[in-house]
């Protein structure tokens, strides 16, 4: 790659002090149109990010290989895209720097994103000053996507770009709708032309394994090293404050590379210099971190110390990135040839090695079939060997295949391959089957067809009352046997599910589908008996019964009364839905009918023993209602009633019954018998003065007949309070004569 660096001075308190410098380490760069080719170009690129025009920027050439841009008068002059072009012919290269306003509405969490072809890139714009409107994403200045302002996650708007390809590269921006571009978050997306670790025309070649955050160039396979590192694999750190492919350049100023952003040829992009981090590259690395943007962790071994610019500084006798390399050929010991684990488990795999120098934790690694390398989390050092323990991330099916344990020391390396089989825990495809049920137990066949891998080691049956939030009860059973769930509640629905397990940690499969199984009711055993009955009309019967006293709760939901009309061959059933009831009124019966009556307790759908039967004769239906009932006040305490006899009488009337009630009163009505059935008039005495009364009457033959119409009448005057109504009757004609 071309040795070209664009430095941006990010000390932003005064824009007039801001400068951009483009430095080339190429031989003869920047000398103009002589034998060495075209000069360095440094300019603001207004094609994508257009900002208000200001005074022209000043370009100054410092010697043969450096050009600086100054003359920024206000912060908005800084916002946008700057580029430096250097190199000759086919090596001509453009380096790009994207500057964001620190006061923008939206700020990028990370400006430069370098991803591999086919990766998912995620651009994250952090809300700095909120606006309640859509966020518009643009790609190279053209509309790309919209997010509603409510779609912010944790104060950030995310643009996900799945399966990115090289044409997706460019400048992306996030802006509130119709806001000034100065308020935008600007990003640079660099998509390598190959997948991870590959380069070349067909991406067939393997990258050298760039260290210290170096990025493999997809065209030539060279590592583009972060500022402050050099070597074909970026394995070597420059001295503090130096950069360039051969560490030949020196950061300006007394504070070294503090406050400078370094932009290098693609696919590297931009970062802080080694040892610095933060949006303005003014923060030193935290302990244990080093390199550009402090993205690297030291993890020094064997007494190495961490330097934030160069990484591990090793004691004598050790070298390597983590001071992990020493002298004699190591050897892997006693590795099993085949291991089996269950899906989604996080097993620990041990790998033991011996050697001189002794293998340490970092020198033993585990490589998965996809090439992922796992580093051990723990090492047990014994006199004759080191055993590295690897905590494997959650296993997926793709992890099945050949794994490799590799040990590397300065004395050499050794490796062993072993097969890993990832098994899928069994999951029932169907619910368990109910074989038989009783009031307090269910017999269940638990073993059903399942997906996943056998063998089945245990079967767990989980059960609890339906719609319950209580914990599930669990019973572990032999796979080949039916299960009896005991001590259940009667007439209760239970949700029952099966869980299958296979051998090994994490062998428990997901619970199968639930099924509802309902226990039976206990059969009611108590026999009621009929206490008595009482005819309340020609079609009404009041029945009462009792139950024997027994200890404990009553097993029953209610009572069933049965009336058998033998003449017509009809049965009438009356459900009394309270087990506490001991009486019932049966209505709508057939007058003049002989019934056989019994009662029995029921529970769910089960009937207990019936009471001994009783025989009841209902009286025939009563006469029709008296006609033309009329009321006439006679005094402040007397009202005369007159009527006409009912028509079409089935027999001689035995009496009339008069009902008296105060109009609007809440009390019970008073019934008065008129025992001389031939009469058609009666006087009701003892009434209250100035009181409105309601009257109606009916006749009786063998049973009471229908009520007449109701009539109203008020007593006269303002007499004393009467004792209560009484009756005197006579023939209507006689009353009229008087």
């Amino acid at each position: 790659a071309v040795d070209l660096t664009l430095l941006a001075n990010l000390r932003l308190t005064d824009p007039q002090r801001f400068f951009l410098t483009c430095v080339s380490g190429e031989a003869g760069a920047g000398r103009g149109s002589d034998a060495w080719g075209p000069p360095l170009l440094l300019e603001k690129d207004d094609r994508i990010v257009r900002t208000p025009p200001g005074p022209p920027l000043r370009l100054a050439r410092n010697g043969s290989h450096q050009v600086t841009l100054r003359g920024f008068s206000k912060p908005s002059d800084l916002v946008g895209v700057f580029s430096c072009v250097g190199g000759a012919g086919a090596r001509r290269t453009r380096v790009i720097y994207v500057h964001n306003s620190p006061g923008a509405h939206l700020l990028p969490d990370k400006v430069t994103h370098t991803v591999n072809k086919g990766d998912t890139a995620v651009l994250s714009a952090r809300v700095h000053k909120e606006k309640q409107t859509d966020v518009i994403w643009k790609s190279n200045g053209s509309y790309f996507y919209t997010l509603d302002w409510h779609e912010a996650q944790d104060g950030r708007f995310l643009l996900q770009l799945p399966n990115v390809q090289p044409p997706s590269s460019g400048i992306y921006s996030a802006t509130y709708l119709e806001a000034s571009p100065l308020g935008s978050a600007f990003f640079r997306l660099i998509v390598r032309g190959c997948g991870a670790g590959r380069w070349g025309p067909g991406c067939t070649k393997e990258c050298p394994g760039c260290l210290h955050g170096g990025v493999c160039h997809d065209h030539d396979g060279e590592c583009v090293c972060p500022p402050g590192f050099t070597g074909t694999r970026c394995e070597q750190a420059c001295r503090e404050g130096r950069f360039g492919q051969s560490c030949q350049e020196q950061c300006p100023g007394i504070s070294g590379c503090r406050g400078l952003t370094f932009c290098l040829p693609d696919p590297y992009g931009c970062s802080c210099g080694s040892g610095w981090r933060g949006s303005q590259c003014q923060e030193a690395c935290a302990p244990g971190h080093f390199g550009a943007d402090c993205r690297l962790q030291c993890q020094c071994q064997n007494g190495g110390t961490c330097d934030r610019f160069s990484g591990c500084v090793c004691p004598s006798g050790w070298h390597g990135v983590h001071c992990e390399k020493s002298d004699r050929i190591p050897q892997i010991l006693n590795m099993a040839s085949e291991l089996e684990f269950n899906l989604e488990t996080m097993p620990r795999i041990n790998c033991a090695a011996a050697g001189n120098p002794f293998p340490v934790r970092g020198s033993i690694e585990l490589r998965k079939p996809d090439g992922t390398v796992l580093l051990s989390t723990k090492a047990i050092v014994e006199p004759e060997k080191t055993t590295a323990e690897f905590e494997v991330p959650r296993l997926v099916l793709a992890d099945s295949g050949f794994w490799e344990c590799r040990v590397s020391t300065s004395g050499g390396q050794d490796s062993r391959r072993f097969k890993v089989n990832v098994k899928v825990p069994p999951v029932p495809l169907a619910a368990p089957r109910l074989l038989t049920k009783q009031s307090r137990q269910l017999v269940v066949s638990p073993l059903v067809s399942f997906s996943g891998d056998g063998p089945i080691s245990t079967v767990r049956l989980h059960y609890r009352p339906q719609d319950s939030t209580m914990d599930w009860s669990t019973i572990v059973v032999d796979p080949s046997e039916n299960v009896t769930l005991m001590n259940l509640r009667p007439k209760t629905g239970y949700s029952v599910r099966v869980q299958l397990s296979r051998p090994g940690e994490g062998g428990e499969g997901a619970w199968g589908p639930p099924t509802l199984m309902t226990t039976d009711c206990p059969e009611p055993l108590l026999q009621p008996w009929l206490e008595g009955w009482h005819v309340e009309g020609t079609d009404r019967l009041r029945v009462s019964w009792s139950l024997p006293l027994v200890p404990g709760p009553l097993v029953g939901d209610g009572f069933l009364l049965r009336l058998w009309d033998g003449t017509r061959g009809q049965e009438r059933r009356e459900n009394v839905s309270s087990p506490q009831a001991r009486t019932a009124l049966l209505t709508g019966l057939t007058p003049g009918t002989h019934y056989q009556l019994d009662v029995q307790l029921y529970h769910c759908t089960l009937l207990g023993p019936a009471s001994p039967p009783a025989h009841v004769l209902l009286p025939p239906s009563g006469p029709p209602a008296p006609r033309h009932l009329h009321a006439q006040a006679l005094s402040d305490s007397e009202i005369q009633l007159t009527w006409k006899h009912p028509e079409a009488l089935p027999g001689p009337i035995s009496k009339y019954v008069v009902e008296v009630q105060v109009a609007g009163g809440a009390g019970d009505p008073l019934w008065i018998d008129v025992d001389r059935p031939e009469e058609t008039s009666t006087i009701i005495r003892g009434l209250n003065a100035s009181t409105r009364y309601l009257f109606r009457m009916r006749a009786s033959i063998q049973g009471l007949g229908d009520w007449s119409n109701t009539v109203e009448e008020s007593t006269l005057g303002n007499g004393l309070q009467a004792e209560g109504p009484v009756q005197e009757s006579r023939a209507a004609e006689e009353g009229l004569d008087q």
Partner: antibody, heavy 116, light 107 residues
Framework: EVQLLESGGGLVQPGGSLRLSCAAS????????MHWVRQAPGKGLEWVSS????????LYADSVKGRFTISRDNSKNTLYLQMNSLRAEDTAVYYC?????????WGQGTLVTVSS | DIQMTQSPSSLSASVGDRVTMTCRAS??????LAWYQQKPGKVPKLLIY???TLQSGVPSRFSGSGSGTDFTLTISSLQPEDVATYYC?????????FGQGTQVEIK
């Protein structure tokens, strides 16, 4: 050329359902916010619903909330409006519209009549 | 929710007249306001967005102004083809209500 073509309108009884479609062409459908707007006979425009590019963010006017569902199939460049529990007052010409802020392109509309 | 109110509901003017209509938002909406033109029996068409920016292809006799709650659409010289109903709309976020419209006729 940007084109939006609605379909699926017709006569439906109160309480019934209808699904409107809007076929889009001439632009990258999956990148744009899409909307449904309706216009009752002789009345003004009423915004009905919006859906953002991913399809995961949808918004509704109070008058249709809980009854209408907007969705999109970016692979088919099609916008949908599922209308349930239709009422007489839902009778209108339904337009789909594209937007980056304002509604810059509109379809020709499809008439929905809710009547017994 | 923000309501948009247009006035007048209708107006009649002669060809060549300067015509003005207003749109008021019940709360401030910055300049997130669009004006649409709907000719009889036709589809609405975007005229102006961001309160004052003319949509590409719209004649320069149309202009918009205002911000916050009060907005104006002006036709500097009314033409026969401008007979239509004009709607304003707030569009920065949901809901995106339209005004009830101003109907423009030629005297």
């Amino acid at each position: 050329e940007v084109q939006l073509l609605e379909s699926g309108g017709g006569l439906v009884q109160p309480g019934g359902s209808l699904r409107l479609s809007c076929a889009a062409s001439g632009f990258t459908f999956s990148s744009y916010v899409m909307h449904w707007v309706r216009q009752a006979p002789g009345k003004g425009l009423e915004w009905v619903s919006s859906i953002y590019p991913s399809g995961g963010w949808t918004l509704y006017a109070d008058s249709v909330k809980g009854r209408f569902t907007i969705s999109r199939d970016n692979s088919k460049n099609t916008l949908y409006l599922q209308m349930n529990s239709l009422r007489a007052e839902d009778t209108a010409v339904y337009y789909c519209a594209r937007a980056v802020g304002p509604f810059d392109y509109w379809g020709q509309g499809t008439l929905v009549t809710v009547s017994s | 929710d923000i309501q948009m109110t247009q006035s007048p509901s209708s107006l009649s003017a002669s060809v060549g007249d300067r015509v003005t209509m207003t749109c008021r938002a019940s709360q401030g909406i910055g300049t997130y306001l669009a004006w649409y033109q709907q000719k009889p029996g036709k589809v609405p068409k975007l005229l102006i967005y961001a309160a004052s920016t003319l949509q590409s292809g719209v004649p320069s006799r149309f202009s918009g102004s205002g911000s916050g709650t009060d907005f104006t659409l002006t036709i500097s010289s009314l033409q026969p083809e401008d007979v239509a109903t004009y709607y304003c709309q707030k569009y920065n976020s949901a809901p995106r209500p339209f005004g009830q419209g101003t109907q423009v006729e030629i005297k």
